[in-house]
């Protein structure tokens, strides 16, 4: 997909960081959701894994930021092939692990 | 070593101006939040605010008691915080310790104010 | 605005366990972070996240939290260990760091 503006993934990430500073209480309720290969994957599967969480307000910004980085409308499921193992992981260890990639991409320069 | 010196310390009169410098040294700067926390002689610590890596946004929080008149900034470049003290007031007298809010923050991780300066004293007298 | 309240003064024999307690309402949700403070020295981080010992830090430290109030505990505090101890957390938004209003542990020789 069109690589997002620098400024836009700072935003992201800002936002990310804002979920989970100093946060200990389970974010949406626990809910779990598909570990991805953010690797292989990025935006568009980061965006499908997460579509599976409704109800949640702490993510709603983060699912509204994530679907402008993707160019075509994710639906559930869409993006199985790249889940790890079939494994799910709790939301906020999701959000922090996915903090961490984008972090490391723009630290490599990929979207300056 | 991870370290933090503090400097421009001093007496003051109310109403004046002063500018504290941190330097950090043994540890990324540029990926760690830093803030700054004053103790009143013979008082607590207290919370001055806190700027967070420019990667994480840059955003600067302050305590109440000093939002518009104090002002954080950083310089990645020379590995060095700031605080801007502006309209001094009595109260303001304490020993001001630069630390380290997030050493690991570009792992995700969150150690809290690992890292403390040895403090520098700001008096505000007539 | 937000406040932690702790404890002004913790009294122990040598070898006896202290419990120094914070409260605070957005604790269930933020976690507690607790510091040393020798006379005259910058603070030094005893626990972090609740439960998590720094490196460097002896074994006898530990910390807990249940609902709005947390914990420090000191099995078989030391003389060595007489200090200023204060809890640390932030507001419900995560953006405004509070510390409580410190409790003077006292290490009766």
């Known amino acids: 997909g069109p690589v997002p503006p620098s400024t836009a993934l700072r935003e992201l990430i800002e936002e990310l960081v804002n979920i989970t500073q100093n946060q200990k209480a389970p974010l949406c309720n626990g809910s779990m959701v598909w570990s991805i290969n953010l690797t292989a994957g990025g935006f568009c599967v980061a965006l499908d894994s997460l579509t599976n969480v409704s109800g949640c307000s702490a993510i709603e910004k983060t699912q509204r930021m994530l679907s402008g980085f993707c160019p075509h409308k994710v639906s559930a499921g869409q993006f199985s092939s790249l889940h790890v193992r079939d494994t799910k992981i709790e939301v906020a260890q999701f959000v922090k692990d996915l903090l961490l990639h984008l972090k490391k991409l723009f630290r490599e320069g990929q979207f300056n | 070593e991870v370290q933090l010196v503090e400097s421009g310390g001093g007496l003051v009169k109310p109403g004046g101006s002063l500018r504290l410098s941190c330097a950090a040294s043994?540890?990324?700067?540029?990926?760690?939040?830093m803030s700054w926390v004053r103790q009143a002689p013979g008082k607590g610590l207290e919370w001055v605010g806190r700027?967070?890596?420019?990667?994480?946004?840059?955003?600067?929080n302050y305590a109440a008691p000093v939002k518009g008149r104090f002002t954080i900034s950083r310089d990645d470049s020379k590995n060095t915080l700031y605080l801007q003290m502006n309209s001094l007031k009595t109260e303001d007298t304490a020993v001001y310790y630069c630390?380290?809010?997030?050493?690991?923050?570009?792992?995700?991780?969150?150690?809290?104010?690992?890292?403390w300066g040895q403090g520098t004293t700001v008096t505000v007298s007539s | 605005s937000y406040e932690l309240t702790q404890p002004p003064s913790v009294s122990v024999s040598p070898g006896q366990t202290a419990r120094i307690t914070c409260s605070g309402d957005?604790?269930?949700?933020?976690?507690a972070y607790w510091y040393q403070q020798k006379s005259g020295q910058a603070p030094v981080l005893v626990i972090y996240?609740?439960?998590k010992r720094p490196s460097g830090i002896p074994e006898r430290f530990s910390g807990s939290s249940s609902g709005t109030m947390a914990t420090l505990t000191i099995s078989g505090a030391q003389v060595e260990d007489e200090a200023d101890y204060y809890c640390?957390?932030?507001?419900?938004?995560?953006?405004?760091?509070?510390f409580g209003g410190g409790t003077k542990l006292t290490v009766l020789g």
């Open positions: 957005a604790l269930p949700e933020k976690y």
């Open positions: 700027i967070r890596s420019k990667i994480d946004g840059g955003t600067i």
């Open positions: 996240e609740d439960t």
């Open positions: 043994g540890f990324t700067f540029s990926n760690a939040w």
């Open positions: 630390a380290t809010d997030q050493v690991g923050a570009y792992y995700g991780d969150y150690y809290g104010m690992d890292v």
């Open positions: 640390y957390s932030t507001d419900s938004s995560g953006n405004h760091g509070v």
